[in-house]
């Protein structure tokens, strides 16, 4: 048997089952592309020299078996062995020291078996009617979710409780409440309705302080940027015991503390100042940038130490947002302006490195042009997102650029830099015979492909050399074949293709000849 | 290994209905794939139905489907066959078996290391 495919025989290891109850569980199976599986489990117990087989039987009732050797994860294709649209039964057997260990099984179909996300980011918790409410967002593209959580305190064990069915973009959870005692609470979820679904990991603790409180200790959580291009930083005030869970542990406890908040905004380095301190009773507003915040805490000793969080950027992009236009003497961008007399800050990174490495420039104050738009132009002797790559780019606006809390996020996008309809080029342009009457083009994807939102479409040109007719095709930017019908035999052809942005119309490949053979009958 | 008891055989006429019951004893019975199994006189023993340990999927011989239910309580140890529209043809010895591993097919008998001793059942036109 292939090691990429499912193996419909025997296994290669005699039935010598354990019983132990050690060995293969947690067993979790989904799709993880268009076509492609994966499987991963845990071992308990000693590893060496364990060899895991995956188990499966068809609703056929035939039953095969994937070798993993020592790994615990495993992925194979659509194509084997295993059918995907109907219903499997998968189970691990682990073979080691002469027996067998058989991990719980799971039942499903696995094309529709999704990686279900447990919840992600901010958990809100709140009171409600002398229960715990959670809220969180639902994971995207996780709608329909069956949700379970987890509790303990600093002297129970792990309790298990049913959330129930969710189907909405928030989910919510209505858990107990302790009077005197913290407790750390764990969600997960899996798909809803899925017979055997998987369950997801379980999230990050979510530590609760008790109904009672003691003395406040700081946290914050980030919301969502606004249309405005602004998010509020938040400050949750979190209560905290001497004894917390085990998951819950190193928050120090506080005293009677004054707090000052220190905001470091890390993007767009060209800017006049960079950090803003302020009372922490007055929360500010945020650009999409990333920054560093500080809490300084001060008691009537004197000061503490400084808690420090770092805010990710909002790596949302928008990429109809920005236009491009390049001419002879330069490039020019235009986006929708945001006021009369705003300083904008344009940062640019190439894909793929470093946050360190961006580069950015901040326009005079300037107002919208007759079309409501602002624009940042440059040359090309400037050397600004002139190599040909893929280069994410964000700007903010501010109409008080010396005011930290007062710069928003316009836009975030990607632009392919230098001369893109030359360098998006496709090459490796290749025709096959398809029928009597067609063929199949085939070219390497564009270096535009790279770069998200960039590459609008690729476009086939076929000219008949005799007649000289020419007809386009235009293609998906995610396709790379094109299928040509209608043609005749004996003719010559030539066949190039080129790859179109949104701005730009690309270069076409060299042309490739080809010709259909006359089929002669006997 | 684990032992299998089956109960529940008996004489029916055409058309009725009988419930088989096996119940195991011995090694965890949560870690058997459950199989049922017939021999009619001067034939082969053919599969009847099967069920997987976690007693999701199931499986049936064409002979049976949408007539037979196989189903399984793991906290009971018991493995159980629901026939309904009994035919004469279903006349046979009913053998409950167990696989604590199973091969190329849920169907083929060399799967199963455990027998009961069985259970006659005899439908009468």
């Known amino acids: 048997c292939r090691t990429s495919e499912c193996c419909f025989q025997d296994p290669p290891y005699p039935d010598a089952d354990s019983g132990s109850a050690s060995g293969p569980r947690d067993l979790r199976c989904y799709r993880i592309s268009s076509d492609r599986y994966e499987c991963s489990w845990q071992y308990e117990g000693p590893t060496a020299g364990v060899s895991h087989f995956l188990r499966c039987c068809l609703s056929s009732g035939r039953c095969c078996y994937f070798a993993a050797g020592s790994a615990t994860r495993l992925q194979f294709s659509d194509q084997a062995g295993v059918s995907v649209l109907y219903t499997v039964t998968l189970w691990v057997e682990s073979w080691a020291r002469n027996q067998t260990e058989k991990s719980p099984e799971v039942t499903l179909q696995l094309y529709n078996s999704v990686k279900y996300e447990p919840p992600l980011g901010d958990i809100k918790v709140s009171k409600l009617a002398g229960q715990l409410r959670m809220e969180w967002e639902t994971p995207d593209n996780q709608v329909g979710a069956e949700v379970q959580f987890r509790h303990r305190t600093p002297s129970s064990p792990w309790k298990l409780g049913d959330c129930g069915p969710q189907d909405d973009d928030t989910e919510s959870c209505l858990c107990p409440l302790e009077m005197n005692v913290a407790q750390e609470f764990q969600l997960r979820r899996r798909q809803l309705g899925s017979q055997g679904s998987s369950w997801s990991k379980w999230s990050s603790p979510v530590c609760v302080p008790p109904e009672n409180p003691p003395q406040p200790q700081v946290r914050f959580s980030v919301e969502q940027l606004g249309q405005d291009g602004r998010r509020r930083l938040t400050l949750k005030e979190q209560p905290t015991q001497l004894e917390l869970p085990e998951g819950c542990q190193g928050l120090a406890p506080g005293t009677e503390v004054t707090y000052r908040l220190q905001l470091h905004m890390l993007s767009c380095p060209c800017k006049a100042k960079a950090t803003r301190t302020l009372h922490l009773g007055k929360m500010p507003y945020l650009s999409g940038a990333a920054y560093n915040v500080a809490v300084i805490s001060s008691n009537q000793f004197g000061p503490g130490l400084n808690q420090t969080w770092h805010i990710p950027a909002d790596t949302h992009t928008e990429p109809v947002a920005l236009n491009i236009s390049v001419g002879t003497n330069g490039t020019t961008m235009y986006w929708p302006a945001r006021a009369q007399s705003m300083t904008y800050c344009i940062e640019w990174q190439p894909v793929g490195q470093d946050g360190g490495l961006a580069t950015c420039s901040l326009t005079a104050p300037q107002d919208p042009d007759p079309a409501g738009m602002a624009t940042y132009s440059w040359s090309r002797e400037s050397g600004a997102m002139g190599q040909e790559k893929c280069y994410y780019i964000t700007i903010f606006a501010s109409a008080h650029p010396e005011k930290l809390t007062l710069w928003s996020t316009v836009l975030s996008t990607y632009h392919f830099g230098g001369n893109a309809s030359a360098a998006g080029t496709p090459h490796h342009v290749s025709v096959k015979n398809h029928s009597l009457d067609s063929v199949s083009v085939d070219w390497a994807p564009s270096l535009l492909s790279t770069c998200p939102g960039v590459l609008k479409e690729y476009v086939v040109r076929c000219r008949d050399e005799d007649s000289k007719q020419v007809s386009e095709h235009p293609v998906q930017p995610t396709e790379t074949q094109v299928t040509l019908s209608g043609l005749r035999a004996g003719v010559a052809y030539t066949v190039q293709v080129r790859a179109d942005t949104a701005w730009l119309r690309g270069v076409w490949s060299q042309p490739q000849r080809f010709s259909i053979e006359v089929q002669v009958s006997d | 290994q684990v032992q299998l008891v089956e109960s529940g055989g008996g004489l029916v006429q055409a058309g009725g209905s009988l419930r088989l019951s096996c119940a195991a004893s011995?090694?965890?019975?949560?870690?058997?794939?459950m199989g049922w199994f017939r021999q009619a006189p001067g034939q082969e023993r053919e599969f009847v139905a099967a069920i997987m340990r976690n007693g999701i999927m199931t499986y049936y011989a064409d002979s049976v489907k949408g007539r037979f239910t196989i189903s399984r309580d793991n906290a009971k140890n018991t493995v159980y066959l629901q026939m309904n529209t009994l035919k004469p043809d279903d006349t046979a010895v009913y053998y409950c078996?167990?696989?604590?591993?199973?091969?190329?097919?849920?169907?083929?008998?060399?799967?199963?290391?455990?027998w009961g001793q069985g259970t006659q059942v005899t439908v009468s036109s």
């Open positions: 078996a167990a696989a604590s591993r199973v091969g190329v097919s849920i169907s083929q008998s060399s799967s199963y290391t455990s």
């Open positions: 011995g090694r965890t019975f949560s870690s058997y794939v």
